[in-house]
């Protein structure tokens, strides 16, 4: 019987060009976490295997850093990074637990107001 629950950072926003930490936490279960997959829509971004360590998708290795903990750090954010992210905890013997995070990447305030401060 699956008794665990996943807590996430929920809906978050960040500025374009900045970075953000995606975090999930599995609680209320004694199941062993074997692997955590991080996905964006249907695309696998990264995995952290308890024995075999972190692996980042080649498509994202320049902008994704492992951690802290089982979380994921996204860097050099673009507006295209807006969307749903999922942490999928593979646990023994329970099975999989999935958490959802929605990230909105906003135009930075510098980009929005930069034209006002142009040097003549």
């Amino acid at each position: 019987m699956m008794t665990g629950t996943i807590e996430t950072t929920g809906n978050i926003s960040a500025e374009k060009g900045g970075s953000i930490i995606l975090q999930c936490h599995l609680s209320s279960t004694t199941a062993q976490v074997t692997q955590v997959n991080w996905e964006q829509q249907d695309q696998l971004l990264a995995i952290c295997n308890a024995d075999l360590g972190w692996h980042i998708s080649p498509s994202f290795k320049d902008r994704v850093a492992p951690g802290p903990g089982l979380g994921l750090t996204l860097q050099s954010l673009t507006v295209n990074d807006t969307g749903e992210y999922f942490c999928i905890y593979h646990t023994y013997p329970d099975g999989t637990y999935t958490g959802r995070i929605f990230l909105e990447v906003l135009e930075s305030s510098v980009a929005e107001h930069g034209a006002r401060f142009q040097i003549p």
Epitope: N49, H55, S57
Partner: nanobody
Framework: EVQLVESGGGLVQPGGSLRLSCAAS????????MGWFRQAPGKEREFVSS????????VYADSVKGRFTISADNSKNTAYLQMNSLKPEDTAVYYC???????????WGQGTLVTVSS
């Protein structure tokens, strides 16, 4: 159920080379992380190397970096560990490991013995 069978171990002189193979059963091989651990006599099992994304992502223990190379052939469901410049301290039983979605835990092979001695 995922099953792993290692081969390629044996006796080699210091400075020599060996290539270990790990044949995996199961349909999800190409999407899984795979790797190698080793256990020397009287010591704890230690991580050696792992691979994912068809070889685009590899990780090595500091003790083998520059000497060992991990690779995978998805068409053969096989992972390899090329071991060069072997040292006596590389003597150990080498185990192949991969994640098994069948039962939500890592599957381990039975191991293959590597002995480095003159």
């Amino acid at each position: 159920e995922v099953q792993l069978v290692e081969s390629g171990g044996g006796l080699v002189q210091p400075g020599g080379s060996l290539r270990l193979s790990c044949a995996a059963s199961g349909p999800t091989f190409s999407t899984n992380v795979m790797g190698w651990f080793r256990q020397a006599p009287g010591k704890e099992r230690e991580f050696v190397s792992s691979i994912h994304w068809g070889g685009s992502s590899t990780v090595y223990a500091d003790s083998v970096k520059g000497r060992f190379t991990i690779s995978a052939d998805n068409s053969k469901n096989t992972a390899y560990l090329q071991m060069n410049s072997l040292k006596p301290e590389d003597t150990a039983v080498y185990y192949c490991v991969t994640y098994s979605a069948y039962d939500f835990r890592n599957a381990w092979g039975q191991g293959t013995l590597v002995t480095v001695s003159s």
